[in-house]
């Protein structure tokens, strides 16, 4: 054997964020020499599942007919060829939404904001939670976490944006979660449309407030600025 077998590719269809009760298919793609595929779930000592390869043997399907809390988590897959087991795939994080009631998302002072001004998106939950996520539709890296420190639970999290540019415009939703499982999220909030009206000059975000301009604005993570307003909440970039 020249070296370790190449690691397979692991992905989920229709995606890795699945609403409670919906179906999801996990795919593991290896090589044509594969004889068996194995799916492991973090903290599960036995192989989580195993399947024969589908013809032409380079991938296997693991079906979840109805998403529940038990399926949420971190997965890796392997394949076995005549010379042994492959390296593990990169992890797949399967997240379930619908574990808790939906939070409310609002914009302060208003969802209609002038370019160059400030706006704060406020995500509020009915019950205390310790993680809040803000998601922008059609962003390649949509998740921004605000997570409480020391397990302190909050009813809300603020996501400040300043100065606002046209990049910030779009549709947002937020989720809330408990720290004991980052794979279980609330139902999504109702969408909030943030409308950025133009000014004579759109201020260009400083390098510390944005990322490289190599990609278009929709490919960038949302990067609000300023200090975290809620004591006990820390910002985490995904």
């Amino acid at each position: 054997q020249a070296g370790p077998l190449p690691k397979p590719t692991l992905w989920a269809e229709p995606g890795s964020v699945i609403s409670w009760g919906n179906s999801v298919t996990i795919w593991c793609q290896g090589t044509l020499e594969a004889r068996e595929y194995r799916l492991d779930k973090e903290e599960s000592p036995a192989p989580w599942d195993r399947q024969n390869p589908l013809e032409p043997k380079n991938k296997a399907r693991f079906s979840i007919p109805s998403m529940t809390e038990d399926y949420a988590g971190r997965y890796r897959c392997y394949y076995r060829s005549p010379v042994g087991w492959s390296q593990p795939s990169d992890p797949l994080e399967l997240v379930m939404t619908g574990a808790y009631s939906k939070p409310t998302l609002s914009a302060l002072p208003s969802p209609l904001v002038t370019s160059g001004k400030s706006v704060t998106l406020l995500c509020q939950s009915r019950s205390p939670m310790d993680t809040f996520l803000l998601i922008k539709e059609r962003a390649a890296h949509p998740l921004l976490h605000l997570r409480s420190e020391h397990g302190a639970q909050q009813h809300q999290a603020e996501f400040p944006m300043s100065p606002v540019t046209s990049v910030h415009g779009g549709t947002y939703r937020c989720f809330s979660s408990h720290g004991f499982s980052h794979y279980l999220l609330s139902h999504p909030s109702d969408p909030l449309e943030l409308i950025v009206s133009g000014s004579l000059e759109d201020p260009r975000p400083s390098p510390t407030r944005s990322v490289s301009t190599a990609a278009g604005p929709e490919d960038q993570p949302l990067m609000p600025t300023g200090s975290v307003p809620h004591s006990g909440l820390r910002r985490h970039w995904e």
């Epitope: 004889r35 599960s44 000592p45 036995a46 989580w48 599942d49 024969n52 076995r80 005549p82």
Partner: antibody, heavy 124, light 107 residues
């Protein structure tokens, strides 16, 4: 020590169903898959299917897919095999057997402990 | 499904004899071959896994070898307590399949 204790012999009529139990002890039940295998009188061993007690995932022999149902009760560390629409050729000894990793290296898996077997007789 | 052909179906040997059983798979099983012992009462025990690895507590007189499609199980010195039926089983692909068994008796 690892023990798999199965339920007693059963006599069933054609068309009926049978449910065989297998109580595990001496190890962590959810750490090992459970296999079910049968042996007709004077015949070899035939694999029915397997179940992962930690999540209920199952794989079946195509031959038994429509008639066999494997379940577990993790609270009592018990596995069950139900076979429906019984016919005379289902008369056999049914075994549960633990499947897991052997040795230190990745990938060596085998059935390492077996139950004592349950005789199911199908007769009109 | 992979077919496993085991031979002989039965044999009779004297205490102390060397006993050999063969198992042939219908396709390459990459050494994923296990051997089991079934005593007359029905109890089944794993003896050898992955062609040649001795399961814990199994006497060293039992051994296995082979590769590809052809595998061999050997008892180097037959003992009275070895009276049993021996089965090979492939674990290369689902479903696992078994050989027809070899019944070993004492002359």
């Amino acid at each position: 020590q690892v023990q798999l204790v199965q339920s007693g012999a059963e006599v069933k009529k054609p068309g009926a169903s049978v449910k065989v139990s297998c109580k595990a002890s001496g190890y962590t039940f959810t750490n090992y898959w459970m296999h079910w295998v049968r042996q007709a009188p004077g015949q070899g061993l035939e694999w029915i299917g397997e179940i992962n007690p930690s999540n209920g995932r199952t794989n079946y022999n195509e031959k038994f897919k429509t008639r066999a149902t494997l379940t577990v009760d993790t609270s009592t560390s018990t596995a069950y095999m139900e076979l429906s629409s019984l016919r005379s050729e289902d008369t056999a000894v049914y075994y549960c057997a633990r499947w897991g990793q052997l040795g230190l290296r990745e990938g060596y898996y085998a059935v390492d402990y077996w139950g004592q077997g349950t005789l199911v007789t199908v007769s009109s | 499904d992979i077919q496993m052909t085991q031979s002989p179906s039965s044999l009779s040997a004297s205490v102390g004899d060397r006993v050999t059983i063969t198992c042939r798979a219908s396709q390459d099983i990459s050494n994923y071959l296990n051997w089991y012992q079934q005593k007359p009462g029905g109890a089944v025990k794993l003896l050898i896994y992955y062609t040649s690895r001795l399961h814990s507590g199994v006497p060293s007189r039992f051994s296995g070898s082979g590769s590809g499609t052809d595998y061999t199980f050997t008892i180097s010195s037959l003992q009275p307590e070895d009276i049993a039926t021996y089965f090979c089983q492939q674990g290369n692909t689902l479903p696992p399949t078994f050989g027809g068994g070899t019944k070993v008796e004492i002359k």
